[in-house]
Protein backbone atom coordinates (compact mmCIF):
# COMPACT_ATOMS: atom_id res chain seq x y z
CA UNK A 1 0.00 0.00 0.00
CA UNK A 2 1.56 3.34 -1.01
CA UNK A 3 2.21 5.55 1.99
CA UNK A 4 0.26 8.85 2.18
CA UNK A 5 2.57 11.76 1.49
CA UNK A 6 2.03 15.44 2.26
CA UNK A 7 1.49 17.43 -0.95
CA UNK A 8 3.18 20.82 -0.83
CA UNK A 9 2.74 23.69 -3.26
CA UNK A 10 6.38 24.02 -4.28
CA UNK A 11 8.65 21.88 -6.45
CA UNK A 12 10.19 18.83 -4.83
CA UNK A 13 13.82 18.23 -3.93
CA UNK A 14 16.20 18.67 -6.84
CA UNK A 15 16.90 15.29 -8.39
CA UNK A 16 20.16 13.67 -7.31
CA UNK A 17 20.36 16.19 -4.46
CA UNK A 18 22.78 14.22 -2.23
CA UNK A 19 25.11 13.50 -5.13
CA UNK A 20 24.96 17.13 -6.26
CA UNK A 21 25.83 18.53 -2.84
CA UNK A 22 28.68 16.06 -2.38
CA UNK A 23 30.05 16.70 -5.89
CA UNK A 24 29.86 20.47 -5.42
CA UNK A 25 31.67 20.20 -2.11
CA UNK A 26 34.47 18.13 -3.66
CA UNK A 27 34.75 20.53 -6.60
CA UNK A 28 34.82 23.59 -4.32
CA UNK A 29 37.54 22.17 -2.09
CA UNK A 30 39.62 21.30 -5.15
CA UNK A 31 39.31 24.81 -6.58
CA UNK A 32 39.93 26.56 -3.23
CA UNK A 33 43.13 25.22 -1.64
CA UNK A 34 42.35 26.93 1.68
CA UNK A 35 39.31 24.63 1.98
CA UNK A 36 41.12 21.39 1.11
CA UNK A 37 40.85 20.22 4.72
CA UNK A 38 37.04 20.09 4.56
CA UNK A 39 35.61 16.58 4.87
CA UNK A 40 32.80 16.61 2.30
CA UNK A 41 31.13 13.51 3.71
CA UNK A 42 30.83 15.27 7.08
CA UNK A 43 29.48 18.35 5.31
CA UNK A 44 26.81 16.26 3.60
CA UNK A 45 25.94 14.50 6.87
CA UNK A 46 25.51 17.89 8.58
CA UNK A 47 23.43 19.23 5.68
CA UNK A 48 21.23 16.14 5.69
CA UNK A 49 20.89 16.30 9.47
CA UNK A 50 19.39 19.77 9.22
CA UNK A 51 16.21 18.60 7.50
CA UNK A 52 15.92 14.80 7.32
CA UNK A 53 13.18 13.32 9.58
CA UNK A 54 12.01 16.83 10.49
CA UNK A 55 8.72 18.45 9.60
CA UNK A 56 9.55 20.69 6.63
CA UNK A 57 7.60 23.59 8.14
CA UNK A 58 9.42 23.38 11.46
CA UNK A 59 13.04 24.03 10.51
CA UNK A 60 15.12 26.43 12.63
CA UNK A 61 18.47 28.19 12.27
CA UNK A 62 19.71 25.89 15.03
CA UNK A 63 19.15 22.90 12.73
CA UNK A 64 21.80 24.31 10.40
CA UNK A 65 24.33 25.09 13.12
CA UNK A 66 26.39 21.89 12.61
CA UNK A 67 26.66 22.76 8.91
CA UNK A 68 27.65 26.37 9.71
CA UNK A 69 30.52 25.09 11.85
CA UNK A 70 31.88 22.93 9.03
CA UNK A 71 31.56 25.80 6.55
CA UNK A 72 33.91 28.09 8.47
CA UNK A 73 35.76 30.20 5.92
CA UNK A 74 37.84 33.36 5.60
CA UNK A 75 35.96 36.09 3.75
CA UNK A 76 37.59 39.54 3.54
CA UNK A 77 34.91 41.61 5.25
CA UNK A 78 35.51 44.66 3.04
CA UNK A 79 35.12 42.70 -0.22
CA UNK A 80 31.50 41.60 0.09
CA UNK A 81 29.06 41.99 -2.79
CA UNK A 82 25.38 41.57 -2.02
CA UNK A 83 22.80 41.36 -4.79
CA UNK A 84 19.06 41.35 -5.30
CA UNK A 85 17.24 39.93 -8.33
CA UNK A 86 20.39 40.09 -10.47
CA UNK A 87 22.36 37.03 -9.44
CA UNK A 88 23.91 36.18 -12.81
CA UNK A 89 25.62 39.54 -13.30
CA UNK A 90 26.81 39.57 -9.68
CA UNK A 91 28.42 36.17 -10.20
CA UNK A 92 29.92 37.18 -13.54
CA UNK A 93 31.42 40.18 -11.76
CA UNK A 94 33.06 38.18 -8.95
CA UNK A 95 34.37 35.65 -11.46
CA UNK A 96 36.36 38.52 -12.98
CA UNK A 97 36.97 40.58 -9.83
CA UNK A 98 38.34 37.59 -7.93
CA UNK A 99 38.97 39.43 -4.67
CA UNK A 100 35.25 40.15 -4.18
CA UNK A 101 32.74 37.63 -2.85
CA UNK A 102 29.04 36.98 -3.18
CA UNK A 103 27.46 34.50 -0.78
CA UNK A 104 27.49 31.91 -3.57
CA UNK A 105 31.27 32.25 -3.82
CA UNK A 106 31.53 30.74 -0.32
CA UNK A 107 31.38 27.00 0.26
CA UNK A 108 27.94 27.07 1.89
CA UNK A 109 26.40 29.31 -0.76
CA UNK A 110 27.98 27.31 -3.56
CA UNK A 111 26.60 24.03 -2.20
CA UNK A 112 22.99 25.18 -2.14
CA UNK A 113 22.77 27.62 -5.06
CA UNK A 114 19.64 26.95 -7.18
CA UNK A 115 18.77 23.75 -5.31
CA UNK A 116 15.57 22.74 -3.51
CA UNK A 117 15.35 20.21 -0.69
CA UNK A 118 13.06 18.94 2.05
CA UNK A 119 12.35 15.83 4.05
CA UNK A 120 9.40 14.37 5.89
CA UNK A 121 8.60 14.17 9.57
CA UNK A 122 9.67 10.87 11.14
CA UNK A 123 11.04 9.25 7.98
CA UNK A 124 14.57 9.32 6.62
CA UNK A 125 13.25 9.91 3.10
CA UNK A 126 13.98 12.96 0.98
CA UNK A 127 10.81 14.33 -0.63
CA UNK A 128 11.36 14.52 -4.37
CA UNK A 129 7.66 15.12 -5.11
CA UNK A 130 7.01 18.49 -3.46
CA UNK A 131 8.41 20.90 -0.87
CA UNK A 132 6.75 23.77 1.01
CA UNK A 133 6.36 27.04 -0.83
CA UNK A 134 7.39 30.08 1.23
CA UNK A 135 4.14 31.96 0.56
CA UNK A 136 1.55 29.23 0.08
CA UNK A 137 2.72 26.75 2.73
CA UNK A 138 5.19 28.02 5.34
CA UNK A 139 8.22 30.25 5.74
CA UNK A 140 10.18 27.95 8.09
CA UNK A 141 10.96 25.45 5.36
CA UNK A 142 14.45 23.95 4.83
CA UNK A 143 15.44 26.12 1.86
CA UNK A 144 14.16 29.44 3.20
CA UNK A 145 15.68 28.91 6.65
CA UNK A 146 19.02 27.94 5.11
CA UNK A 147 19.23 31.11 3.00
CA UNK A 148 17.99 33.30 5.84
CA UNK A 149 20.67 31.84 8.11
CA UNK A 150 23.63 32.15 5.76
CA UNK A 151 22.49 35.54 4.43
CA UNK A 152 22.22 36.91 7.96
CA UNK A 153 25.69 35.61 8.87
CA UNK A 154 27.17 36.92 5.61
CA UNK A 155 25.77 40.40 6.23
CA UNK A 156 26.96 40.33 9.85
CA UNK A 157 30.48 39.60 8.62
CA UNK A 158 30.65 42.64 6.30
CA UNK A 159 32.71 45.74 7.05
CA UNK A 160 33.88 49.08 5.62
CA UNK A 161 32.21 49.60 2.22
CA UNK A 162 29.63 46.98 1.29
CA UNK A 163 28.39 46.84 -2.29
CA UNK A 164 24.99 45.69 -3.47
CA UNK A 165 23.96 45.07 -7.08
CA UNK A 166 20.29 45.87 -7.79
CA UNK A 167 18.19 45.20 -10.88
CA UNK A 168 17.10 48.50 -12.43
CA UNK A 169 14.70 46.71 -14.79
CA UNK A 170 12.33 45.64 -12.02
CA UNK A 171 9.35 47.62 -10.83
CA UNK A 172 10.78 47.54 -7.31
CA UNK A 173 14.51 48.12 -7.73
CA UNK A 174 14.82 47.75 -3.97
CA UNK A 175 12.31 45.24 -2.61
CA UNK A 176 11.80 45.14 1.15
CA UNK A 177 10.59 41.55 0.82
CA UNK A 178 13.72 40.23 -0.93
CA UNK A 179 16.45 38.46 1.07
CA UNK A 180 18.54 41.60 0.72
CA UNK A 181 15.70 43.85 1.88
CA UNK A 182 14.36 41.68 4.68
CA UNK A 183 17.53 40.05 6.04
CA UNK A 184 20.84 41.47 4.85
CA UNK A 185 20.03 45.19 5.19
CA UNK A 186 19.01 44.69 8.82
CA UNK A 187 22.06 42.61 9.74
CA UNK A 188 24.78 44.95 8.50
CA UNK A 189 26.65 46.08 11.62
CA UNK A 190 26.81 49.89 11.88
CA UNK A 191 29.95 49.71 14.02
CA UNK A 192 31.73 47.83 11.24
CA UNK A 193 30.06 49.04 8.04
CA UNK A 194 30.76 52.62 7.01
CA UNK A 195 28.92 52.73 3.67
CA UNK A 196 26.48 50.70 1.62
CA UNK A 197 27.05 51.44 -2.06
CA UNK A 198 24.26 50.41 -4.43
CA UNK A 199 24.99 49.66 -8.07
CA UNK A 200 21.76 49.97 -10.04
CA UNK A 201 22.05 47.91 -13.21
CA UNK A 202 20.19 49.29 -16.23
CA UNK A 203 18.47 46.94 -18.65
CA UNK A 204 17.66 49.00 -21.72
CA UNK A 205 20.43 50.19 -24.01
CA UNK A 206 19.00 53.67 -24.36
CA UNK A 207 18.01 54.01 -20.72
CA UNK A 208 19.76 57.15 -19.45
CA UNK A 209 17.51 57.83 -16.45
CA UNK A 210 19.08 58.32 -13.05
CA UNK A 211 17.64 55.27 -11.32
CA UNK A 212 19.34 56.31 -8.08
CA UNK A 213 16.41 58.74 -7.75
CA UNK A 214 13.88 55.89 -7.85
CA UNK A 215 11.48 55.96 -4.86
CA UNK A 216 12.51 52.47 -3.75
CA UNK A 217 16.19 53.50 -3.74
CA UNK A 218 15.24 56.50 -1.61
CA UNK A 219 13.47 54.07 0.70
CA UNK A 220 16.65 51.97 0.94
CA UNK A 221 18.68 55.12 1.64
CA UNK A 222 16.29 56.01 4.44
CA UNK A 223 16.50 52.55 6.05
CA UNK A 224 20.31 52.53 5.84
CA UNK A 225 20.70 56.11 7.10
CA UNK A 226 18.51 55.35 10.11
CA UNK A 227 20.93 52.54 10.93
CA UNK A 228 23.82 55.06 10.97
CA UNK A 229 25.37 53.68 7.81
CA UNK A 230 26.18 56.00 4.92
CA UNK A 231 24.58 55.34 1.56
CA UNK A 232 25.79 55.94 -1.96
CA UNK A 233 24.38 54.94 -5.32
CA UNK A 234 25.76 54.53 -8.84
CA UNK A 235 24.00 53.88 -12.12
CA UNK A 236 25.53 51.13 -14.24
CA UNK A 237 24.10 52.15 -17.61
CA UNK A 238 25.94 49.54 -19.65
CA UNK A 239 26.41 46.28 -17.73
CA UNK A 240 28.18 44.63 -20.69
CA UNK A 241 30.70 47.46 -20.82
CA UNK A 242 30.93 47.46 -17.03
CA UNK A 243 32.07 43.81 -17.04
CA UNK A 244 34.42 44.43 -19.95
CA UNK A 245 36.03 47.30 -18.06
CA UNK A 246 36.43 45.19 -14.94
CA UNK A 247 38.31 42.70 -17.13
CA UNK A 248 40.35 45.38 -18.92
CA UNK A 249 40.41 48.54 -16.81
CA UNK A 250 43.20 50.09 -18.88
CA UNK A 251 41.01 50.12 -22.01
CA UNK A 252 40.66 53.73 -23.20
CA UNK A 253 36.86 53.47 -23.42
CA UNK A 254 36.69 52.70 -19.71
CA UNK A 255 37.34 56.20 -18.49
CA UNK A 256 33.87 57.38 -19.56
CA UNK A 257 30.75 56.66 -17.52
CA UNK A 258 29.46 53.10 -17.72
Amino acid sequence: VPRWRQQWSGPGTTKRFPETVLARCVKYTEIHPEMRHVDCQSVWDAFKGAFISKHPCNITEEDYQPLMKLGTQTVPCNKILLWSRIKDLAHQFTQVQRDMFTLEDTLLGYLADDLTWCGEFNTSKINYQSCPDWRKDCSNNPVSVFWKTVSRRFAEAACDVVHVMLNGSRSKIFDKNSTFGSVEVHNLQPEKVQTLEAWVIHGGREDSRDLCQDPTIKELESIISKRNIQFSCKNIYRPDKFLQCVKNPEDSSCTSEI
Epitope: T72, Q73, T74, R153, E156, E191
Partner: nanobody, 117 residues
Protein backbone atom coordinates in the same frame (compact mmCIF):
# COMPACT_ATOMS: atom_id res chain seq x y z
CA UNK B 1 37.47 49.83 13.03
CA UNK B 2 37.67 46.42 14.69
CA UNK B 3 41.11 45.73 16.17
CA UNK B 4 42.18 42.64 18.08
CA UNK B 5 45.43 41.48 19.64
CA UNK B 6 45.87 37.85 20.64
CA UNK B 7 48.39 36.66 23.24
CA UNK B 8 49.17 33.74 25.53
CA UNK B 9 50.41 31.16 23.05
CA UNK B 10 53.55 29.15 23.49
CA UNK B 11 55.11 25.70 23.64
CA UNK B 12 53.39 23.22 25.95
CA UNK B 13 53.62 19.48 26.52
CA UNK B 14 50.72 17.15 25.69
CA UNK B 15 48.23 17.20 28.57
CA UNK B 16 49.27 20.73 29.53
CA UNK B 17 47.26 23.94 29.70
CA UNK B 18 47.36 27.46 28.26
CA UNK B 19 45.15 30.50 28.53
CA UNK B 20 44.81 32.70 25.46
CA UNK B 21 43.68 36.32 25.64
CA UNK B 22 42.36 38.67 23.01
CA UNK B 23 42.26 42.41 23.64
CA UNK B 24 39.70 44.13 21.43
CA UNK B 25 39.20 47.77 20.47
CA UNK B 26 37.38 49.96 17.98
CA UNK B 27 33.85 48.65 18.61
CA UNK B 28 31.37 48.14 21.43
CA UNK B 29 32.75 44.81 22.56
CA UNK B 30 29.69 43.69 24.53
CA UNK B 31 27.44 44.10 21.47
CA UNK B 32 29.24 41.38 19.53
CA UNK B 33 29.49 37.65 19.72
CA UNK B 34 33.18 36.68 19.61
CA UNK B 35 34.87 33.55 18.34
CA UNK B 36 38.14 31.70 18.40
CA UNK B 37 39.28 30.08 15.17
CA UNK B 38 42.53 28.30 14.44
CA UNK B 39 44.73 27.37 11.54
CA UNK B 40 47.03 24.37 11.82
CA UNK B 41 50.21 24.29 9.69
CA UNK B 42 49.26 23.59 6.08
CA UNK B 43 45.56 23.35 6.93
CA UNK B 44 42.51 25.56 6.50
CA UNK B 45 40.63 27.65 9.01
CA UNK B 46 38.83 25.71 11.75
CA UNK B 47 36.18 27.17 14.04
CA UNK B 48 36.91 26.48 17.72
CA UNK B 49 34.36 28.30 19.88
CA UNK B 50 31.90 31.20 20.07
CA UNK B 51 30.52 33.21 22.97
CA UNK B 52 27.52 35.56 22.88
CA UNK B 53 27.88 39.28 23.55
CA UNK B 54 26.66 39.00 27.11
CA UNK B 55 28.68 35.86 27.74
CA UNK B 56 25.70 33.66 28.56
CA UNK B 57 25.78 31.46 25.47
CA UNK B 58 28.79 29.38 24.41
CA UNK B 59 29.39 26.81 21.69
CA UNK B 60 32.36 24.54 20.94
CA UNK B 61 33.72 22.40 18.15
CA UNK B 62 33.37 18.69 18.92
CA UNK B 63 37.16 18.35 18.87
CA UNK B 64 37.62 20.72 21.85
CA UNK B 65 34.36 20.22 23.80
CA UNK B 66 35.09 19.49 27.48
CA UNK B 67 38.74 20.59 27.20
CA UNK B 68 38.48 24.26 26.17
CA UNK B 69 36.48 27.02 27.85
CA UNK B 70 35.66 30.34 26.20
CA UNK B 71 34.90 33.38 28.37
CA UNK B 72 34.93 37.15 28.18
CA UNK B 73 35.29 40.19 30.42
CA UNK B 74 33.28 42.98 28.82
CA UNK B 75 34.58 45.54 31.31
CA UNK B 76 38.10 44.86 29.97
CA UNK B 77 37.11 44.30 26.32
CA UNK B 78 38.89 40.97 26.51
CA UNK B 79 38.12 37.48 25.22
CA UNK B 80 39.72 34.35 26.70
CA UNK B 81 40.25 30.73 25.78
CA UNK B 82 41.27 28.35 28.56
CA UNK B 83 42.80 25.27 26.94
CA UNK B 84 43.31 22.14 29.04
CA UNK B 85 44.41 18.57 28.20
CA UNK B 86 46.17 19.87 25.12
CA UNK B 87 46.96 17.45 22.30
CA UNK B 88 49.41 17.53 19.40
CA UNK B 89 46.49 18.14 17.04
CA UNK B 90 45.71 21.41 18.85
CA UNK B 91 48.92 22.87 17.43
CA UNK B 92 47.87 25.91 15.38
CA UNK B 93 47.81 29.67 15.16
CA UNK B 94 44.78 30.83 17.17
CA UNK B 95 42.87 33.93 16.11
CA UNK B 96 40.03 35.77 17.77
CA UNK B 97 37.37 37.27 15.53
CA UNK B 98 34.18 39.25 15.94
CA UNK B 99 30.97 37.43 15.06
CA UNK B 100 29.76 33.87 15.19
CA UNK B 101 30.78 32.73 11.75
CA UNK B 102 30.88 30.84 9.53
CA UNK B 103 32.42 33.80 7.69
CA UNK B 104 35.42 35.32 9.43
CA UNK B 105 37.91 38.03 8.64
CA UNK B 106 40.38 37.89 11.49
CA UNK B 107 42.23 41.16 12.05
CA UNK B 108 44.90 40.09 14.53
CA UNK B 109 48.25 38.40 13.98
CA UNK B 110 47.15 35.37 15.98
CA UNK B 111 49.07 33.54 18.67
CA UNK B 112 50.92 30.29 18.01
CA UNK B 113 50.18 27.29 20.22
CA UNK B 114 52.61 24.38 19.86
CA UNK B 115 51.86 21.13 21.66
CA UNK B 116 54.90 18.87 21.64
CA UNK B 117 56.98 16.77 23.97
Amino acid sequence: EVQVLESGGGLVQPGGSLRLSCAAAGFTFSNFAMSWVRQAPGKGLEWVSTISGGGGGTDYADSVEGRFTISRDNSKNTLYLQMNSLRAEDTAVYYCADGRGPFFDYRGQGTLVTVSS
